[in-house]
Interface confidence: low
């Protein structure tokens, strides 16, 4: 999908409002420190690229993101203020439900919502990191 | 109305340093990253770097990494590019401008050097 | 470093012309280029960015494409105030590079 079409200020305001502290809630317990962050993205359709990959690509030892509140508040975020996005993601859809039984926090997991915390604020401050 | 205002032209000697001002207003200055493009007489347009005016960050091209130097003032909300050991080739229109994903949408008028001895 | 290779480097038109300019990359930059306009003495002004999404204030007339590292700026009926340089740059990441220009000339 091309994210480039998408209305950022009102995704940054969903992502302030509710996405952010939904992430937080999901780290608690962790230490801010603990996992370095790899994934970078540079421009903000960039980084919506990454988000949605992190949040809903199943990868190994994480598979059960995308029913968690900040995931699915992305994916309404996407929904509403990315033209087209929606039809995009049937399939993805059904291949999420497949891959995804219950709900399981594992050390991948923290690790990858980590990542996703240094996208998101990424993507409120774009430029900060090239490639 | 976002406007970047730049200082005035300047008439400089081979050697000598130049600082160039960019007073920006009406947005919020540290919401957006400032760059600096340069256009010698008849030429193209040359990116010089970037600085983040929220905690000063700054990206400089490898040319410029020992001559340039750009600043921010928040109090002020403007923005500077010193460059030293000017010498001829350096003479040229020196733009700043605004930018949240890389393109710019807003400029300075530009401000001449001229490097002349 | 991404090399952007802008043609043709000037083109005689006449209003009411359709112009097409093309800027291609050296790699793959996505939809990160934009597209200015630069009359003499004038700072550039914003015409597109992300390839395809027209600037605040900017006429119909001018559009942009992308097909895989090439672009597309498009002037489809020449108007007398369009007679100027036209420059692409990605925005994909440093060092931020620019076209070598397009000078669009009245025939």
């Known amino acids: 999908y091309d994210f480039t079409n998408c209305d950022f200020e009102k995704i940054k305001a969903a992502y302030l409002s509710t996405i952010s502290k939904d992430l937080i809630t999901y780290m608690s317990g962790t230490k801010s420190t603990e996992f370095n962050n790899t994934v970078s993205c540079s421009n903000r359709p960039h980084c919506l690229t990454e988000i949605q990959s992190l949040t809903f690509n199943p990868t190994a030892g994480c598979a059960s993101l995308a029913k968690e509140m900040f995931a699915m508040k992305t994916k309404a975020a996407l929904a509403i203020w990315c033209p087209g996005y929606s039809e995009t993601q049937i399939n993805a859809t059904q291949a999420m439900k497949k891959a995804r039984k219950s709900k399981v926090t594992t050390n991948k997991c923290l690790e990858q919502v980590s990542q996703l915390q240094g996208l998101w604020r990424r993507f409120n401050r774009p430029l900060l990191k090239q490639q | 109305e976002v406007q970047l205002v730049q200082s005035g032209a300047e008439v400089k000697k081979p050697g000598a340093s130049v600082k160039v001002s960019c007073k920006a207003s009406g947005y919020t200055f540290t919401t957006y990253w400032m760059h600096w493009v340069r256009q010698a007489p008849g030429q193209g347009l040359e990116w010089i770097g970037m600085i983040d005016p929220s905690d000063s960050e700054t990206t400089l091209i490898q040319k410029f990494k020992d001559r340039a130097t750009l600043t921010v003032d928040k109090s002020t909300s403007t923005a500077y590019m010193e460059l030293s050991s000017l010498r001829s080739e350096d003479t040229a229109v020196y733009y700043c401008?605004?930018?949240?994903?890389?393109?710019?949408?807003?400029w300075g008028q530009g401000t001449t050097v001229t490097v002349s001895s | 470093d991404i090399q952007m290779t802008q043609s043709p480097s000037s083109l005689s038109a006449s209003v009411g012309d359709r112009v097409t300019i093309t800027c291609r990359a050296s790699e793959n930059i996505y939809s990160y280029l934009a597209w200015y306009q630069q009359k003499p003495g004038k700072a550039p002004k914003l015409l597109v960015y992300?390839?395809?999404t027209l600037a605040e204030g900017v006429p119909s007339r001018f559009s942009g494409s992308v097909s895989g590292t090439d672009f597309t700026l498009t002037i489809s009926s020449l108007q007398p105030e369009d007679f100027a340089t036209y420059y692409c740059?990605?925005?994909?990441?440093?060092?931020?590079?620019f076209g070598g220009g397009t000078k669009v000339e009245i025939k």
């Open positions: 740059q990605h925005h994909y990441g440093t060092p931020w590079t």
């Open positions: 992300f390839a395809k």
């Open positions: 401008a605004r930018t949240l994903d890389g393109y710019y949408d807003y």
